[in-house]
């Protein structure tokens, strides 16, 4: 009876279990009753990082100098290239697809410490009573407006991203 499931590092095809190709190799032809799976090493600047049945290897990531990137770790047939930013620059994401001089703090966050040549911007959440409604690399959280000092009342509460809205006091006639 043909198998319905295969062991680890195998795959099911044409009612039989074939060996997967090891990392660094791609599939050329599936196994048959009489032959083993045929695999071929990935070419230069290509990789596959898992046991697989892929017919094409993946291209190594390109660290584009026009985006401020450089190679941190050269790729192998089993691993992708790892990019990093030129000195003094910072990755925009964990994948490091581009570089910025320093990151900015989003609305709801203020700048705790402005970036230097060696450290990126440090952001902090705006605490109760403070807000930031902009993305900035230098602005701190701003205190909510004090309606009382303007002889006004709070008409709309503030948040970490918005100031309070003040309005006139209701006068009793």
């Amino acid at each position: 009876e043909p198998p319905t499931a295969c062991r680890e590092k195998q795959y099911l095809i044409n009612s039989q279990c074939c060996s997967l190709c090891q990392p660094g190799q791609k599939l050329v032809s599936d196994c048959t009753e009489f032959t083993e799976t045929e695999c071929l090493p990935c070419g230069e600047s290509e990789f596959l990082d898992t046991w697989n049945r892929e017919t094409h290897c993946h291209q190594h990531k390109y660290c584009d100098p026009n985006l401020g990137l450089r190679v941190q770790q050269k790729g192998t047939s089993e691993t992708d290239t790892i990019c990093t930013c030129e000195e003094g620059w910072h990755c925009t994401s964990e994948a490091c697809e581009s570089c910025v001089l320093h990151r900015s703090c989003s609305p709801g966050f203020g700048v705790k410490q402005i970036a230097t040549g060696v450290s990126d911007t440090i952001c902090e959440p705006c605490p109760v009573g403070f807000f930031s409604n902009v993305s900035s690399a230098f602005e701190k959280c701003h205190p909510w407006t004090s309606c009382e000092t303007k002889d006004l009342v709070v008409q709309q509460a503030g948040t970490n991203k918005t100031d309070v809205v003040c309005g006139p006091q209701d006068r009793l006639r």
């Epitope: 401020g68 620059w89 925009t92 581009s98 001089l101 993305s135 900035s136 690399a137 602005e139």
Partner: nanobody, 116 residues
Amino acid sequence: EVQLLESGGGLVQPGGSLRLSCAASGFTFRDYEMWWVRQAPGKGLERVSAINPQGTRTYYADSVKGRFTISRDNSKNTLYLQMNSLRAEDTAVYYCAKLPFPFSEWGQGTLVTVSS
């Protein structure tokens, strides 16, 4: 395409003044926080000054406080840096940059040399 074109640099004696300009195009200038950043020969990038989109709030590095003034004219899509009481240590290439400071959007800069 974002373009930032710095100008106004040159050779000036210590104690002298210069006004740098940065002409911006390819984006809505009035929506962006802008910075002046400089790089002295053989040194890293130093954040000099920043201004919010409306031009109402500013930041200055301690090294230039009281001597430099950042401003902007949103109707002309232009950023300025007025530099007074210049010192030898202000010698650098000055760049303007827009949030979020992508490497790909930097101009060529303008060279300021302070020397007697």
